[in-house]
């Protein structure tokens, strides 16, 4: 672990109650193929324990989905992941919108410091799947 | 390659016959800028050589699509990327579906291990494009 | 840097004269989170400096959009990233179209070499979104 | 085995409406899209619209504005319907499966063929 | 539209000999890379038959001494040896983009 390799696979394990819109994730072998390896959660918010560029990604499919349930909802589904503390480094890092598709999946480097929480905000409606290969949220110390 | 910086990166060779949903790969400087350094192809199938975490990444694009192709038919189009082989440890890794429209592209971490055969199955009746900027599929190694 | 981590996320400045479809980066921590460490800018286009296997990814927004703005153009929306110098190594590397989206996503590996100065082409008259979470360009390099 | 069967008029007066039936056996419309072509001596093979698994029609532009195909996936039917013809319409109509590959757009298996001649 | 012009419009050719047609476009039939350029064999009384599909691929059940090529906008059908029942008229079609078009066609005749 000293090499700074710390690395996180995360599969969805529920949504927030109405007024949050964030996701919350779980990990670790018992769970399947999701993982924990430096980072860790803190109720169900990623946290870094190292300073460095991270490639963070994360991959969000809405449930029971087809290419006119998201035309259906007058507000538009969206998906942002962000800092969200602490709230001096609060800032939105990566941000998708759904429109007329049901998946959405990207991924951005970026510098991150010990003790920043990501969170994964889904704005709308309309609620994501669990099932793990369809939704996943991951994080990879690339380099100081 | 003692460092276990096993890597590939593939581009579509062809579709299989019309009861095989899998696509296909090739590899080599000689067919462009793709490349197998660790893993090998098995039958156009990538087999993974080191055991450790690996980032996969993927992007298909269909052929000669428009905005409406998609929806001329019934049976969605979807792609799934997962081991094939072992059968013992034969699971689905990732899967998007192209709803309305042309390209899907994402990526994710996985534990992958020595003899893991990955596949990639495309449902539905639609060819992909084999141009090499359009669709591609590959791995990185990236810790033990 | 003598390890070879090259490393650099970029974020739009702008878009280039009408007859130029290039996207212009720009990079640095007084930017917000836009970083180059190894690659270096070149009149807002991105140049390589070490040779490798490099991972490169971007995602594009399109400004004040909605899943109608794309399909009310006659001329499909398109990003391509590619090397444009020097001109005996220009090929397109990744190539995505909006169809009836506002982003696109997508990231692949590829060997670049020192002097690769990489372009990103968006085709159509609908502009980026300059919002650093919405549209940014990135390498690393993963291995020589 | 597949076969794509085709009924309709012989003869059609001009500036009246053509009106064929395609009913196939040995697939379901729920997969495969199914042309329609025509044939004269004069302008030989003429494509003219193809109907998709979701009821999405594409069609020739030519001939957009006097065309309609639709079908009832239920009976396995595809109806052509071609209003305002003129002697020039005389020709040989054929449907036709697509391939399996949706976006080949090729025809792996055709009809007999519906013979239409548009005279007074 | 895509016009594609088929020659010869007649070939009269031996038992055993090996049959040329050509099939040009009046465009690339490229995209996505593919080559989306087919052919078809047509007997009297009979709708055509799907024998050559994206320029070299047999559809199934159609003999070996059929044989298609080309690239771009020049394309090709062989036929070696050519046998009695292959006395027929041939097309070749596109499919790159709507509206597809068909050749005029190249008589075989058997002398």
């Known amino acids: 672990e000293s090499l700074g390799w710390d690395i996180a696979e995360l599969q969805l394990n529920h949504t927030g109650p109405q007024q949050d819109p964030r996701l919350y994730w779980q990990g670790g072998p018992a769970l399947g193929r999701s993982f924990l390896r430096g980072p860790e959660l803190d109720k169900g918010q990623l946290r870094i324990r190292r300073d460095g560029i991270y490639m963070v990604h994360i991959q969000v499919t809405l449930a029971i989905c087809s290419s006119t349930s998201t035309s259906r909802h007058h507000h538009p589904t969206t998906l942002a992941v962000g800092i969200c503390s602490p709230a001096s480094r609060s800032i939105s890092l990566l941000r998708l919108s759904f429109h007329q598709g049901c998946t959405i999946a990207s991924q951005r480097l970026t510098p991150l410091a010990r003790g920043d929480t990501l969170c994964t905000n889904l704005t709308g409606t309309l609620l994501p799947s669990r099932n793990t290969d369809e939704t996943f949220f991951g994080v990879q110390w690339v380099r100081p | 390659e003692s460092l276990g910086w096993d890597i590939a990166e593939l581009q579509l060779n062809h579709t299989g016959p019309q009861q095989d949903p899998r696509l296909y790969w090739q590899g080599g400087p000689a067919l462009g800028r793709s490349f197998l350094r660790g893993p090998e192809l098995d039958k156009g199938q990538l087999r993974i050589r080191r055991d450790g975490i690996y980032m996969v990444h993927i992007q298909v694009t269909l052929a000669i699509c428009s905005s409406t192709s998609t929806s001329r038919h019934h049976h969605p189009t979807t792609l799934a990327v997962g081991i094939c082989s072992p059968a013992s440890r034969s699971i689905s890794l990732l899967r998007l579906s192209f709803h309305q429209g042309c390209t899907i592209a994402s990526q994710r971490l996985t534990p992958l291990a020595r003899g893991d055969t990955l596949c990639t199955n495309l449902t539905g009746t639609l060819l992909p494009s084999r141009n090499t900027d359009e669709t591609f599929f590959g791995v990185q190694w990236v810790r033990p | 840097e003598s390890l070879g981590w090259d490393i650099a996320e970029l974020q739009l400045n702008h878009t280039g004269p009408q007859q130029d479809p290039r996207l212009y980066w720009q990079g640095g921590p007084a930017l917000g989170r836009s970083f180059l460490r190894g690659p270096e800018l070149d009149k807002g286009q991105l140049r390589i400096r070490r040779d490798g296997i490099y991972m490169v990814h971007i995602q594009v927004t399109l400004a004040i959009c909605s899943s109608t703005s794309t399909s009310r153009h006659h001329h499909p929306t398109t990003l391509a990233v590619g090397i444009c110098s020097p001109a005996s190594r220009s090929i397109s590397l990744l190539r995505l179209s909006f169809h009836q989206g506002c982003t696109i996503a997508s990231q692949r590996l590829t060997p670049l070499a020192r002097g690769d100065t990489l372009c990103t082409n968006l085709t159509g008259t609908l502009l980026p979104s300059r919002n650093t979470d919405e549209t940014f360009f990135g390498v690393q390099w993963v291995r020589p | 085995q597949v076969q794509l069967k085709q009924s309709g008029p012989g003869l059609v007066q001009p500036s009246q409406k053509l009106s064929i039936t395609c009913t196939v056996s040995g697939f379901s419309l729920t997969t495969y899209g199914v042309h329609w072509i025509r044939q004269s001596p004069v302008k030989g093979l003429e494509w003219l619209g193809v109907?998709?698994?979701?009821?999405?029609?594409d069609y020739n532009a030519a001939f957009i504005s006097r065309l309609n195909i639709t079908k009832d996936n239920s009976k396995s039917q595809i109806f052509f319907k071609m209003n305002s013809l003129q002697t020039n319409d005389t020709a040989m109509y054929y449907c036709?499966?697509?391939?399996?590959?949706?976006?080949?757009?090729?025809?792996?298996?055709w009809g007999q063929g519906t013979s239409v001649t548009v005279s007074s | 539209d895509i016009v594609l012009t088929q020659s010869p419009a007649s070939l009269p050719i031996f038992l055993g000999q090996r049959a040329t047609i050509s099939c040009r476009a009046s465009?690339?039939?490229?995209?996505?890379?593919?080559?989306?350029m087919h052919w078809y064999q047509q007997k009297p009384g009979q709708p055509p038959k799907l024998l050559i599909y994206l320029v070299s691929n047999l559809e199934s059940g159609v003999p070996a001494r059929f044989s298609g090529s080309g690239s771009g906008t020049d394309f090709t059908l062989n036929i070696h040896p050519v046998e009695e029942e292959d006395a027929a008229t041939y097309y070749c079609?596109?499919?790159?983009?709507?509206?597809?078009?068909f050749g005029a066609g190249t008589k075989l005749e058997l002398k």
């Open positions: 109907i998709w698994t979701t009821g999405v029609v």
């Open positions: 079609q596109h499919s790159r983009e709507f509206p597809l078009t």
């Open positions: 465009r690339s039939v490229s995209a996505s890379g593919y080559t989306f």
């Open positions: 036709a499966r697509n391939s399996y590959y949706g976006n080949l757009y090729v025809m792996d298996y």
